[in-house]
């Protein structure tokens, strides 16, 4: 039975040209995290493997940095970066947990962080 929950940074906004940290946290389970995938729609941005560490997809190497922790830093943001991002926790023995973050990249300096929320 999957007992864990993923807490994410929820709906967030950031300024064009700036950077943002995407964060997820898996709690309420003793399952071992074997890998975390970060995806944007159907594109794989990065992988953090418990053995091998981080691997950034080649097409994102210039704008994505690993961490902090299991989070992901997006740099040099453009309006095209607006959209859904997913943290996918592969765990043993529970299986897969997925968290969702919606990022809006704004032209102005009105960017504010949304509230945190949980996905069971």
């Amino acid at each position: 039975m999957m007992t864990g929950t993923i807490e994410t940074t929820g709906n967030i906004s950031a300024e064009k040209g700036g950077s943002i940290i995407l964060q997820c946290h898996l709690s309420s389970t003793t399952a071992q995290v074997t890998q975390v995938n970060w995806e944007q729609q159907d594109q794989l941005l990065a992988i953090c493997n418990a053995d091998l560490g981080w691997h950034i997809s080649p097409s994102f190497k210039d704008r994505v940095a690993p961490g902090p922790g299991l989070g992901l830093t997006l740099q040099s943001l453009t309006v095209n970066d607006t959209g859904e991002y997913f943290c996918i926790y592969h765990t043993y023995p529970d299986g897969t947990y997925t968290g969702r973050i919606f990022l809006e990249v704004l032209e102005s300096s009105v960017a504010e962080h949304g509230a945190r929320f949980q996905i069971p």
Epitope: C48, D51, L52, G53, A65
Partner: antibody, heavy 121, light 107 residues
Framework: EVQLLESGGGLVQPGGSLRLSCAAS????????MSWVRQAPGKGLEWVSA????????YYADSVKGRFTISRDNSKNTLYLQMNSLRAEDTAVYYC??????????????WGQGTTVTVSS | DIQMTQSPSSLSASVGDRVTITCRAS??????LNWYQQKPGKAPKLLIY???SLQSGVPSRFSGSGSGTDFTLTISSLQPEDFATYYC?????????FGGGTKVEIK
């Protein structure tokens, strides 16, 4: 005693192939990531490839991607590096190494003695 | 890719000297930094992992410090067997990258 023993090196012509092997002993092989690192004559160390303990994840340096394949047989405690389309710049001593292990922030803590690959016509 | 820059590339020192080697990462690597020693014709040997943790069996005269982008390997009192080449390496992300090496020679 924890030990890694490489074999399979030798002289090969450009465009040729070789398969390196690394026999592991003294530790639970299947629970550790493994890496290949090379050193060209008179040069520094260059990471080549790594594979997770299960073999499910593999990564490569750009310089060998598409030409080299890392694999492992956990039932035989052996790591492999299949090298195809070899070039003169692949000439080096090839080391297998235990690790790294990201979650423990551990480095490559055991190394083999190295096997020499020479690519020349 | 994360670039690792080591300095100096070589140094001359005497037995008993305190030796410091520095390594800089092109971006933050937290403490995912390892130090290796290599002698001619031999395989590298892990000295320090996680920036400051001494590998089992390594003499306590070796120490490491730093976090983020700047790291240091210190040999508190150089011994005859310490003349070798030293490499830093990041293990945060693939491709794992090594510094260019520092050759420690006898003065």
């Amino acid at each position: 005693e924890v030990q890694l023993l490489e074999s399979g090196g030798g002289l090969v012509q450009p465009g040729g192939s070789l398969r390196l092997s690394c026999a592991a002993s003294g530790f639970t092989f299947s629970t550790y990531a493994m890496s290949w690192v090379r050193q060209a004559p008179g040069k520094g160390l260059e990471w080549v490839s790594a594979i997770s303990g299960s073999g499910g994840s593999t990564y490569y340096a750009d310089s060998v991607k598409g030409r080299f394949t890392i694999s492992r047989d956990n039932s035989k405690n052996t790591l492999y590096l299949q090298m195809n389309s070899l070039r003169a710049e692949d000439t080096a001593v090839y080391y297998c190494a235990k690790g790294p292990r990201y979650q423990d922030r551990a480095g490559m803590d055991v190394w083999g003695q190295g096997t020499t690959v020479t690519v020349s016509s | 890719d994360i670039q690792m820059t080591q300095s100096p590339s070589s140094l001359s020192a005497s037995v008993g000297d305190r030796v410091t080697i520095t390594c800089r990462a092109s971006q933050s690597i937290s403490s995912y930094l390892n130090w290796y020693q290599q002698k001619p014709g031999k395989a590298p040997k892990l000295l320090i992992y996680a920036a400051s943790s001494l590998q089992s069996g390594v003499p306590s005269r070796f120490s490491g410090s730093g976090s983020g982008t700047d790291f240091t390997l210190t040999i508190s009192s150089l011994q005859p067997e310490d003349f070798a080449t030293y490499y830093c390496q990041q293990s945060l992300a693939t491709p794992y990258t090594f510094g260019g090496g520092t050759k420690v020679e006898i003065k």
